[in-house]
């Protein structure tokens, strides 16, 4: 499965804050010379979307990870390289697989 | 300790080049996004660029977009930062920071945790 | 671009009362009731040091006397009581994911 084939990370900070597993997607070579400004908040008064042109690298909760996350939204953290999950109520876990 | 040590500063001509370098040490480099912050003479802070853990991910603000580069060489826990066509108002105290982050219920919330001494760099003729 | 504005440019605050900084953003800040606004703290011939993160917590090691709080476009920074080390510039910056990321024109202190 995809615990076996991704590397989990785990994110220590601090002891009042939960910690959390990311996975990072494998990396292509030609990857590190993407750039990206593409904005992920939707704020009033946000950005249109004249900054995507340089997009490149396509989100990995779209694509590998798309069923990653079992009760929840994937998320992909650029800044990191690594895809998290937003559980829904209830949920909690490295996927949000547990109850 | 986590330590960051810049260096590469000093006087360049206008249109001139320069390449900062930023050592990285006492952490795990490849677990952190890093940025470059200036300070101009004015005391103003500035954002200059970012990478990502891996350096698949950068991000430029406007003012240095197309003559500035940012890359990390991970083997090495070292950042750089190539600028190119140096301009009169890119003189400052240049400054690598880390970006320390909490992760938590798929929310990531990022600041500026551990800051270098900075190296200077002078735009005249 | 979100744009940050810190007042006062500068105070002056007696040794043992209360300082107050204010930090307010040209648009939120917030996503999804979180604060992306953080605060440091710079002496002269030093880099700036992380006091305040995520609006209201306090960077690790640091005395309680430094409070921040807000929300949105408001965010204020609190120092008290006010001690002679704290005489230094005070700057917000706003850490949205979504670049550029910005920081305020600074708050000079000075302790009386």
């Known amino acids: 499965g995809l615990n076996d084939i991704f590397e989990a990370q785990k994110i220590e900070w601090h002891e009042s804050v939960r910690v959390e597993q990311v996975v990072k997607p494998p990396q292509n070579k030609t990857e590190s010379e993407n750039t990206s400004d593409k904005p992920k908040r939707k704020k009033k008064g946000g950005k249109n979307g004249k900054n995507r042109r340089n997009r490149k690298k396509k989100n990995p909760c779209n694509a590998e990870f798309q069923n990653f996350c079992i009760h929840g939204e994937c998320k992909y953290i650029e800044h990191l390289e690594a895809v998290t999950c937003k559980c829904q109520q209830e949920y909690f876990g490295e996927r949000c697989g547990e109850k | 300790e986590v330590q960051l040590q810049e260096s590469g500063g000093g006087l360049v001509k206008p249109g001139g080049s320069l390449k900062l370098s930023c050592a990285a040490s006492?952490?795990?480099?490849?677990?952190?996004?890093m940025s470059w912050v200036r300070q101009t003479p004015e005391k103003r802070l500035e954002w200059v660029a970012t990478?990502?853990?891996?350096?698949?991910?950068?991000y430029y603000p406007d003012s240095v977009k197309g003559r500035f580069t940012i890359s990390r060489d991970n083997a090495k826990n070292t950042l750089y930062l190539q600028m190119s066509s140096l301009r009169s108002e890119d003189t400052a105290m240049y400054y690598c920071?880390?970006?320390?982050?909490?992760?938590?219920?798929?929310?990531?919330?990022?600041?500026?945790?551990?800051w270098g001494a900075g190296t200077t760099v002078t735009v005249s003729s | 671009d979100i744009v940050l504005t810190q007042s006062p440019a500068s105070l002056a605050v007696s040794l043992g009362q209360r300082a107050t900084i204010s930090c307010k953003a040209s648009q939120s800040v917030d996503y999804d009731g979180h604060s992306f606004l953080n605060w440091y703290q710079q002496k002269p011939g030093q880099p700036p040091k992380l006091l305040i993160y995520a609006a209201s917590n306090l960077e690790s090691g640091l005395p309680a006397r430094f409070s921040g709080s807000g929300s949105g476009t408001d965010f204020t920074l609190n120092i008290h009581p006010v001690e002679e080390e704290d005489a230094a510039t005070y700057y917000c910056?706003?850490?949205?994911?979504?670049?550029?990321?910005?920081f305020g024109g600074g708050t000079k202190l000075e302790i009386k």
């Open positions: 910056q706003q850490s949205t994911e979504d670049p550029p990321y910005t």
């Open positions: 990478i990502s853990t891996g350096g698949s991910h950068t």
């Open positions: 006492g952490f795990t480099f490849n677990s952190y996004a």
């Open positions: 920071a880390r970006h320390g982050y909490l992760l938590y219920d798929g929310y990531y919330e990022w600041y500026f945790d551990v």
